[in-house]
């Protein structure tokens, strides 16, 4: 029988009545077009919904948009279109919501062709009121808030001007022309690339990278011959053209571009690309595309300076620049990432790492599951996860994998069980231990969301037919109850719950269609009465993350420490609550070779924890670039993994001697950098 249909499932008492009393319908008498929904602030209950409708007429497009606001998590909505003067809002810019709990919102309006500039509507009170502001430019991008100060905004114009506002969009100043890409760094710093000759496209590889730390009063050129740049964690990366040919290399800076080092990564040609897959303050995952139109490349993981890289995974699926990769950070357990590889026979397989890219393995076959037609051996196969690539290929996959930091260990994903990803209709699988073991959770494709830090999982079947049923589980997906939320089925368009998985509410969006009319409709369901009481100490049990062998003294050690968590018992039907904080207890582990990555010039042979010298470098001095100088490295092949906290145990020696010899690309050496003032 399907999960949740056995007698073992403890049913939640009187849930139909409890949910019926907490189901709120909202109907919008709008023409059916598109709906976008944004949460404003954290735990405020404020939702903004923008409905838009386009009719392409012969000469122009007729557009209409409506704005609705809820302040009770979607139970009731008020039409506030009049607050934006019934103006048509451009959906491609979305709703720009301010960071943290600033309560700021910027909507970008559609303006007529001949106007001097664009128009925005600004709110700083969680969308209770809006101020109309006419812009001195036409925006090309959504307004970008400084992460440090939500009054500071930047935007690029259609003329490639970089515009900054210091008073939340009231007044704007163009601080630079000919700008291709701009990003906020830390401490209100802005990084941007500029072109000198024709355009961003024409000057690709000849761009300059600039920095301003005072919102455009003064500038510093921190790089030339730039192809592109990116920020990840505390690292600033620049892809720089080589002097002699059309290849480019990654350079990295950890001091906002004052000094640069050449990353020990392969250079790439014109048709290839680099991509930062994930980064934190400790390290970075970098994808380097293979030459040719292969659709794959190699993942490298960095050391703590972003300079020395270890090969992490070969044949990593990544279709094209800005294309699709399945690389997923499993946020519910430290060190876990899932991605796809393209095997030699062109099938796609899922791989998982539990130690931040140190080792990758296939996902364990779920218990009680059969291997599908892709499996050569019907008894031995793995789980393969559908993510961005499957979605882009229009497979029957409505959602990417889901995990939440406060729902410890839980990962939900569509998948198939075999030797590779299957094009057959997938099922939904769940892991409660961060990806080590998996169970089939639901038959067929579903939309799913996590509520109350994992206390409730909600799912809706993905169907082309109208729906009126949701499913929910209070025991991490073991048992499911179904609730009919309306007598009249709706064409489902989306499932929305407040980001952060702390909420108890979900909103189901869709539309109804009758002979002449079509209406938007939303149902918001509050699960607070299902979880009647607050969880107590007895509702939690202790769990050791990453445990694979209790007889191993260092069981659970990952990156030098192990963590025990208090986890909600599956049988406990209670509220974690909005203020729930994950209780965990770390303990430091002894160092072993697993806590070190192979240093520059060394590699790990498969299934070996020892680092050995790369044959081509045997007998050569190990020299590499650091801060524009050549360094001589004396090493026995190991460097501590970034973020690793182990102490004692194995301790390989390592020493770096400064050769004071210049070696980075000269266009990134500090002497060439100049400062300019406006």
């Amino acid at each position: 029988s399907a999960p949740g249909e056995d007698e073992e499932c403890g049913r939640v008492r009187d849930f139909v009545a409890k949910l019926a009393n907490n189901t709120h319908q909202h109907v919008a008498d709008d023409l059916r077009g598109s709906v976008s929904l944004s949460w404003v602030g954290d735990s405020t209950g404020v939702i903004l919904v923008l409905t838009t409708f386009h009719v392409p007429l012969v000469i122009m497009t007729f557009g209409q948009s409506k704005l609705y606001r809820s302040e009770d998590y979607g139970k009731n909505f008020k039409d506030i279109t009049d607050l934006i003067n019934n103006t048509f809002i451009r959906t491609e810019f979305g709703m720009a919501i301010g960071p943290e709990n600033s309560g700021k919102v910027v909507l970008t309006a559609e303006v007529s062709g001949g106007s001097r500039g664009g128009r925005i509507f600004r709110s700083s009170d969680f969308a209770k009121n809006f101020v109309q502001t006419d812009l001195p430019f036409h925006p090309l991008t959504q307004m970008m808030y400084s992460p440090q100060n939500s009054d500071y905004l930047l935007a690029l114009s259609t003329e490639n001007g970089l515009w900054v506002s210091k008073n939340f969009g009231g007044k704007w100043e163009e601080i630079h022309k000919a700008v291709c890409l701009a990003k906020w760094g830390s401490d209100n710093t802005i990084f941007f690339t500029t072109y000198a000759n024709g355009s961003c496209k024409a000057d690709l590889g000849a761009l300059e990278l600039w920095r301003t730390s005072d919102l455009g009063k003064s500038f510093k050129t921190i790089g030339v011959k730039i192809y592109s740049f990116g920020l990840g964690g505390r690292f600033l990366f620049a892809s720089v053209m080589a002097d002699k040919d059309t290849t480019r290399r990654i350079h990295v800076s950890t001091d906002q571009g004052d000094t640069w080092s050449m990353a020990q990564l392969p250079s790439v040609g014109q048709e290839q690309f680099y991509s930062i897959l994930a980064a934190n303050d400790d390290m970075v995952f970098m994808h380097v595309d293979e030459p040719g139109d292969t659709g794959f490349g190699t993942i490298f993981t960095s050391d703590d300076r972003g300079i020395v890289y270890s090969k992490s995974l070969d044949r990593h699926l990544y279709t094209t620049t800005g294309g699709e990769t399945d690389f997923t950070n499993v946020t519910s357990l430290r060190g876990v990432y899932i991605t796809s590889v393209l095997s030699e026979d062109n099938s796609i397989q899922t791989m998982i790492t539990f130690d931040q890219g140190g080792r990758w393995t296939h996902l364990r076959k779920p218990e009680n599951s059969e291997c599908d037609a892709t499996a050569k051996n019907k008894n031995e196969c793995s789980l393969h996860i559908h993510a961005s690539y499957s979605i882009s290929q229009k497979l029957n996959v409505p959602m990417a994998p889901l995990s939440e930091p406060n729902a410890v260990g839980i990962v939900i994903a569509h998948g198939s069980v075999g030797d590779a990803i299957s094009v057959m209709v997938p099922d939904v699988y769940i892991s409660d231990d961060g990806g080590y073991s998996w169970t089939k959770m639901l038959e067929g494709p579903h939309y799913y969301t996590i509520l109350d830090s994992g206390g409730i999982i909600v799912a809706i079947e993905h169907s082309s037919r109208p729906i009126n049923v949701i499913k929910f589980s209070t025991d991490e997906g073991q048992c499911w109850q179904t609730y009919t939320f309306t007598r009249d089925p709706i064409y489902f368009t989306g499932l929305a719950s407040e980001p952060g998985a702390r909420s108890m509410n979900i909103s189901i969006w869709g539309f109804t269609e009758s002979f002449l009319t079509s209406q938007w409709v939303s149902y918001t369901i509050d699960f607070k009465d299902i979880l009647e009481r607050n969880c107590e100490e007895k509702d939690y049990t202790i769990w050791l993350a990453h445990s694979t062998d209790p007889e191993d003294y260092e069981d659970g050690c990952i990156l030098g420490y192990k963590e025990q968590f208090l986890r909600l018992r599956k049988s406990s039907v209670c509220q974690n609550g909005r203020d729930y904080v994950v209780t965990k207890q770390p303990s430091i582990c002894l160092c072993s070779l697993e806590d070190f990555l192979c240093d520059f010039g060394y590699y790990r042979p498969e299934n070996d924890s020892k680092c050995v010298e790369q044959p081509e470098l045997k007998g050569h001095d190990l020299e590499f670039c650091l801060y524009g100088r050549e360094e001589h490295l004396t090493t026995n092949g190991y460097r501590k993994i970034p973020g690793d906290k182990c102490q004692g145990g194995v301790n390989p020696v390592r020493e770096v001697k400064d050769l004071k010899k210049k070696c980075t690309s000269n266009f990134l050496s500090p002497e060439k950098q100049n400062s300019k003032s406006n």
């Epitope: 073992e8 231990d433 007895k538 209790p550 191993d552 025990q564 018992r569 049988s571 207890q585």
Partner: antibody, heavy 124, light 106 residues
């Protein structure tokens, strides 16, 4: 082979405290929870609480909350159970037991290794 | 706390008999149930964990089944060494034991 060896029998006066020790040998003590279970004469088994030596995370049955303290010393692979405000009803055999573990959950797989038991007699 | 009700409290049987002991939980405990055997003056011995998994070294005549709230321990063919008291124990809340079932010679 893992063994749990408990301290010897005790005779205590009502109102006093007793501390029973449980020393583990031949296994990875730190990676398993140790539970304490008691059995009054002619009665069934009653769980008192448990501890995970690594980190010292203890939890107790509601009935004994405030009266029992369970500790562990990782360096000597020893767990301790102290019961205070003793009364005659506390006369029982006290067992320590290792919680078997197949996954990261410490308490879900039954108690696979038991101590020989310590008889505590509370009498005035 | 979760209550565990064991039945019968006493069971008379002969060698070779098939013996069944049941245990009921006051709420669903999934499969988190263990069974123990205890002989007079001795510590309990684990027979079954996770409702149906046989502990290593335990004879295969012992088997467990059930999930949710209803569980069963079965001894397929009672041996002289099996006359003892049997306890069930749930592990999905603060641990609680059933009252015990004494299997005696008929």
């Amino acid at each position: 082979q893992v063994q749990l060896v408990q301290s010897g029998a005790e005779v205590k006066k009502p109102g006093s405290s007793v501390k029973v020790s449980c020393k583990a040998s031949g296994g990875t003590f730190r990676n398993y929870a140790i539970s304490w279970v008691r059995q009054a004469p002619g009665q069934g088994l009653e769980w008192m609480g448990g501890i995970i030596p690594i980190g010292g995370w203890a939890n107790y049955a509601q009935k004994f909350q405030g009266r029992v303290t369970i500790t562990a010393d990782e360096s000597t692979s020893t767990a301790y159970m102290e019961l205070s405000s003793l009364r005659s009803e506390d006369t029982a055999v006290y067992y320590c037991a290792r919680q078997g573990r197949k996954t990261g959950y410490y308490y879900y797989y039954g108690m696979d290794v038991w101590g020989q038991g310590t008889t505590v007699t509370v009498s005035s | 706390d979760i209550q565990m009700t064991q039945s019968p409290s006493t069971l008379s049987a002969s060698v070779g008999d098939r013996v069944t002991i049941t245990c009921r939980a006051s709420q669903s405990i999934s499969s988190w149930l263990a069974w123990y055997q205890q002989k007079p003056g001795k510590a309990p011995k684990l027979l079954i964990y996770k409702a149906s998994s046989l502990e290593s070294g335990v004879p295969s005549r012992f088997s467990g089944s059930g999930s949710g709230t209803e569980f069963t321990l079965t001894i397929s063919s009672l041996q002289p060494d099996d006359f003892a008291t049997y306890y069930c124990q749930q592990a999905d809340g603060h641990i609680t034991f059933g009252g015990g079932t004494k299997v005696e010679i008929k």
